[in-house]
């Protein structure tokens, strides 16, 4: 049986899949920061994890997904305040007993060194220096992301 947080992330993913595809994003919108092929937006208020997940979706974005250690370090370099924690799009799936990204993939154990327990109602936050398992009900800031679309030369058939 899925927890309410798992249901929430599945619902958002399904509605995202149903929406008609938008033109690719070539530049980061105003207020967003570019980090490689992503645009990041840092919240200025606090929320539990599921509210943060929902709030990113209102910006046509998702909670941050981190591909590897290198991307984690680059993201952490953007965090200016030492003691601040930010939700990212990773939580503990009770049914699969594993950390699961909101896109449905599982955490590669080498990617992030998580401080804290892997258990029910645990979600992942990052700080300037570390990655933490926190109760998903903890109210902290969060990071949204949008993917930038690489520019490809389109070949149009003769009219």
């Amino acid at each position: 049986q899925k927890s309410s947080i798992e249901k929430c992330s599945v619902d958002i993913q399904q509605s995202r899949n149903k929406t008609t595809e938008r033109p690719g994003l070539l530049n980061c919108p105003i207020y967003w920061q570019q980090l490689r092929e992503k645009c990041l937006l840092f919240s200025h208020t606090v929320n539990p994890w599921n509210n943060s997940l929902a709030d990113c979706s209102t910006k046509e974005s998702s909670l941050l997904l981190i591909r590897d250690k290198d991307e984690l370090i680059h993201t952490q370099n953007l965090i200016r305040d030492k003691a601040i924690l930010f939700w990212i799009g990773l939580n503990f799936s009770l049914s699969e007993k594993n950390w699961k990204w909101i896109n449905g993939s599982f955490l590669n154990s080498n990617d992030l060194e998580i401080r804290g327990d892997a258990k029910e109602n645990s979600c992942i936050s990052i700080s300037q220096t570390s990655v933490y398992s926190e109760y998903c009900s903890t109210e902290i800031r969060w990071i949204c992301q949008k993917e930038l679309t690489p520019v490809r030369n389109k070949v149009y058939p003769d009219s």
Partner: antibody, heavy 120, light 107 residues
Framework: EVQLQQSGPELVKPGASMKISCKAS????????MNWVKQSHGKNLEWIGL????????YYNQKFKDKATLTVDKSSSTAYMELLSLTSEDSAVYYC?????????????WGQGTTLTVSS | DIVMTQSHKFMSTSVGDRVNITCKAS??????VVWYQQTPGQSPKVLID???IRHTGVPDRFTGSGSGTDFTLTISSVQSEDLADYFC?????????FGGGTKLEIK
């Protein structure tokens, strides 16, 4: 009209505590984070902290961590700030101010201010 | 903490003049800067966000510019109702800090 209506001026004795109210109207109270700002000597502005009225989550400027407690009452669309163990240094005008956007730190609506005088 | 310095505590100007009010951050804050106007006996009112974006309803004689550490609020043609204190604020870090204010006086 979007408005934040604060409680009236207060004269309190050193060592006492007091609570300022800020009643929101004209918008969805739970949809915007509330902040509190101190203005002393008619000039100097200091950010005290924030509260998410939807969840009650708070974050404080460390300087005010032991001085201020932020709460909300959703049913009356009212935010509160309690100031503890008051001294003359706490004499100032206190404002509630609405965060304009969840992702930017500017205040788009301010209360009229509550003047606090701490004196024996 | 990031210190926001408004070096001119007072500025004297005449109606119709152009005036530049400056603000300097102690470290790079990008464009995460706000300008507020506080008229006598009133609470602050936002004029400019993100260093240069005019808030809804703000007259176009108010313009913000700058990035990094140096920021300017320009009033292109001062009106008598612009008599006020002007404050800058940074939100590049989550400990929001304000400048000490510049009082604009009309000659």
């Amino acid at each position: 009209e979007v408005q934040l209506q604060q409680s009236g001026p207060e004269l309190v004795k050193p060592g006492a505590s007091m609570k300022i109210s800020c009643k929101a109207s004209g918008y969805s109270f739970t949809g915007y984070t509330m902040n509190w700002v101190k203005q002393s000597h008619g000039k100097n502005l200091e950010w005290i902290g924030l509260i998410n009225p939807n969840t009650g989550g708070t974050y404080y400027n460390q300087k005010f961590k032991d001085k201020a407690t932020l709460t909300v009452d959703k049913s009356s669309s009212t935010a509160y700030m309690e100031l503890l163990s008051l001294t003359s240094e706490d004499s100032a005008v206190y404002y509630c101010a609405r965060l304009g956007d969840n992702y930017r730190g500017y205040f788009d609506v301010w209360g009229q201010g509550t003047t606090l005088t701490v004196s024996s | 903490d990031i210190v926001m310095t408004q070096s001119h505590k007072f500025m004297s100007t005449s109606v119709g003049d152009r005036v530049n009010i400056t603000c300097k951050a102690s470290q790079d804050v990008g464009t995460a800067v706000v300008w507020y106007q506080q008229t006598p006996g009133q609470s602050p009112k936002v004029l400019i966000d993100w260093a240069s974006i005019r808030h809804t309803g703000v007259p176009d004689r108010f313009t913000g510019s700058g990035s990094g550490t140096d920021f300017t609020l320009t009033i292109s043609s001062v009106q008598s109702e612009d008599l006020a204190d002007y404050f800058c604020q940074q939100y590049s870090t989550y400990l929001y800090t304000f400048g000490g204010g510049t009082k604009l006086e009309i000659k």
